[in-house]
Amino acid sequence: SPYSSDTTPCCFAYIARPLPRAHIKEYFYTSGKCSNPAVVFVTRKNRQVCANPEKKWVREYINSLEMS
């Protein structure tokens, strides 16, 4: 999960395994102020999961969410 310092959530580790796409509701990018670039996926259980934006599966999921 992202760590929130004040109102800016930042990620210090990424999930290793791809989430099932069906379990992802939405996503957002963490702030440029964070030391690690990250995509945060919000899941069907309203969990926030940090993912590496350089991973192919992450980019594919973002594209698919943008189109839906």
Partner: antibody, heavy 117, light 111 residues
């Protein structure tokens, strides 16, 4: 591309246990979520359980809860499915699979488990 | 008994089109746009032919197409060929305790 290679066929007696292995290559096991699906002779596909990365734990189908254990050895990129208290109805081909229902879906070749006295 | 309901068998002549239905509920097909279809020849591993309701993996013929309306998904095979004779299974993510649910399978016979 992920490749999954399973262990060979097994013959077991009722009441015994069986442990089927599934070795991953192309990706590390820590980057995959392995699921297990079985198919009894002449029957359909049945999901048994698998790793849910959202919760970070293995989840099992109700039908198998208490009788199946799915484990991983990340040092050898091998997943295992152990089914205990075997009955004749457990005679089936057991498949490991990853990215079930997704575009990168990949299946092992299947392992036939025969339960016979 | 399978969670998703498919006809046990369908048949068609070469060149014809056939449709296989797969009926679920509001907690699986009706809840997600993530329905898949598998083709399985006797003694072989199931092969993914449709995912995300309508998408085809690379290498799968465009004679295979998928659709969905409410709680029912459909697989259409056009220009039937002898090699299409196989069992076809639908599957869907589930919002319940079960991660993935499958249909009971449909045997396609090419006459």
């Amino acid at each position: 591309q992920v490749q999954l290679v399973q262990s060979g066929a097994e013959v077991k007696k009722p009441g015994a246990s069986v442990k089927v292995s599934c070795r991953a290559s192309g990706y590390a096991l820590t980057e995959l979520s392995i699921h297990w699906v079985r198919q009894a002779p002449g029957k359909g596909l049945e999901w048994m359980g698998g790793f849910d990365p959202e919760d970070g734990e293995t989840i099992y189908a109700q039908n198998f809860q208490g009788r199946v254990i799915m484990t991983e050895d990340t040092s050898t990129d091998t997943a295992y499915m152990e089914l205990s208290s075997l009955k004749s109805e457990d005679t089936a081909v057991y498949y490991c699979a990853t990215d079930l229902t997704g575009s990168r879906d990949s299946w092992g070749q299947g392992t036939l488990v025969t339960v016979s006295s | 008994q399978s969670v998703l309901t498919q006809p046990a068998s369908v048949s068609g002549s070469p060149g014809q089109s056939i449709t296989i239905s797969c009926t679920g509920s509001r907690s699986d097909i009706g809840y997600y746009n993530y329905v898949s279809w598998y083709q399985q020849h006797p003694g072989k591993v199931p092969k993914l032919i449709i995912y995300d309701v309508t998408e085809r993996p690379s290498g799968v013929s465009d004679r295979f197409s998928g659709s969905k309306s409410a709680n029912t998904a459909s697989l259409t095979i056009s220009g039937l060929q002898a090699e299409d004779e196989a069992d076809y299974y639908c599957s869907s993510f589930s919002s319940g305790d079960t991660f993935v649910v499958f249909g009971g399978g449909t045997k396609l016979t090419v006459l």
